[in-house]
């Protein structure tokens, strides 16, 4: 039995780890699933952040795992992306759905960050250069669209390179190769890692390597 307190919990199940799998919500002591109608990266971002897996990698329209069972608790989930919990997003009401089946259970793949790396290259030292991120074993770049000093601040702090001195686009530090992992990132400058900034999804972009972004951090400028 339970006395008071919130009666909702969230988990991902049947995935490779706690940060991937079918989305399940516990409401009134019962675990149930979420229907994928209107499923979006904003919802995935909320889930990943809520579970302490702050990188939203992808949002399968349905669970890329076995279908769930029990109640379908949520449908038409609509998030802004800044909600602190999935149940703060709009939906059709608890247990209300439009004839969903468990074949439409929503799934999520987040990352715990442990398989991610970042470096700056072609800048003459470790604290300046083109931004490169290793994701799923492949090094890739970041597009300069809407890139600004807030993004640079996150990168410099993450790499323990001090503060951001400047940022550049148009492949100022040369064109990279491989995937372009990020485009149109939205950072407030306080994120602990670049991949914790809001984004459209890994590898989603409309760029080419002529738009690769770079930064110069204060510790890099000192070495120049």
């Amino acid at each position: 039995s339970s006395l008071g307190g919130t009666d909702k919990e969230l988990r991902l199940v049947d995935g490779e780890n706690k940060c991937s799998g079918r989305v399940e919500v516990k409401v009134q002591e019962e675990w149930g699933t979420v229907c994928n109608n209107g499923w979006s990266m904003e919802a995935v971002s909320v889930i990943c952040n809520q579970l302490g897996c702050p990188t939203a990698i992808k949002a399968p329209g349905w669970a890329n795992s076995s279908a769930g069972s029990g109640r379908i608790w949520m449908d038409h989930v609509s998030c802004r992306g800044n909600e602190s919990a999935l149940w703060d997003c709009k939906h059709d009401g608890w247990g209300k759905h439009s004839n969903c089946t468990h074949q439409q259970d929503a799934g999520v793949t987040c990352s715990d960050g442990s398989n991610l790396e970042m470096r700056l290259t072609r800048g003459g030292n470790m604290c300046s250069g083109r931004i490169e991120i290793k994701f799923q074993g492949r090094w890739g770049t970041v597009c300069d669209d809407n890139f600004n000093i807030d993004h640079a601040s996150v990168i410099c702090r993450q790499l323990e390179c001090g503060s951001a001195v400047s940022f550049s686009g148009s492949s100022n530090f040369g064109e990279g190769s491989g995937p372009i992992w990020f485009d149109d990132l939205i950072c407030n400058g306080n994120e602990s890692a670049l991949w914790n900034c809001k984004h459209q999804g890994w590898g989603k972009h409309n760029c080419d390597h002529a738009e690769d972004a770079g930064v110069i951090c204060s510790k890099g400028a000192d070495l120049s």
Epitope: S1, S2, T6, K90
Partner: antibody
């Protein structure tokens, strides 16, 4: 359609234990839903007392501390409320209420007076 | 516990009027607010769930809106059978709590 019917003593003496029963018709109590008790004081204020889910798990309002117990009798398709150590402040109309999550179905209520 | 503060506590209106009742939560309850109508000697009747969704069989003149802490029940054109007491309640977290009620009377 779920139908709920409360039954109880009407009058209870202070310090005694109140026992109320809700008989459910049109639906099996073990199939689904949360089964709640809600009371309404003479001034019209509503208070949720607690729930028992079809799975058997219970939730109680902390304001009632350990005075409240909700249980199910599946053989009779009933659920019950026990409230111990009653006082005049427990005088109210008691409703049994159910729904998947929301308070969708209400009984007509039973009025309880606590008086010596 | 989340406190639901309803206003006004009583309201006089005429048939055909547009009436608005408000409910404020002491902390955010997302959209998890329900509205109930109660007539003398009867149990509360659910009108709205999840802030704005109409319960089955409830006339479309009733509508709900709001999210976070501020919520509204609106009756677009009062009918004689709408004079009653109205309650809001939050479904966001345990313990579920209710507003103190608004008595809607005939002017």
């Amino acid at each position: 359609q779920v139908q709920l019917q409360e039954s109880g003593p009407g009058l209870v003496k202070p310090s005694e234990t109140l026992s109320l029963t809700c008989t459910v018709s049109g639906y099996s109590i073990t199939s689904d839903y949360a089964w709640n008790w809600i009371r309404q004081f003479p001034g019209k204020k509503l208070e949720w007392m607690g729930s028992i889910y079809y799975s058997g798990s219970t939730y109680y309002n902390p304001s009632l501390k350990s005075r409240v117990t909700i249980s199910v009798d599946t053989s009779k398709n009933q659920f019950s409320l026990k409230l111990s150590s009653v006082t005049a402040a427990d005088t109210a109309t008691y409703y049994c209420v159910s729904g998947t999550y929301y308070f969708d179905y209400w009984g007509q209520g039973t009025t309880l007076t606590v008086s010596s | 516990d989340i406190v639901m503060t309803q206003s006004p506590s009583s309201l006089s209106a005429s048939v055909g009027d547009r009436v608005t009742i408000t409910c404020r939560a002491s902390q955010s309850v997302s959209s998890d607010v329900a509205w109930f109508q109660q007539k003398p000697g009867k149990s509360p009747k659910p009108l709205i769930y999840y802030a704005s969704s109409l319960q089955s069989g409830v006339p479309s003149r009733f509508s709900g809106s709001g999210s976070g802490t501020d919520f509204t029940l609106t009756i677009s054109s009062l009918q004689a059978e709408d004079f009653a007491v109205y309650f809001c309640g939050q479904d966001y977290t345990s313990p579920r709590t209710f507003g103190g009620g608004t008595k809607l009377e005939i002017k």
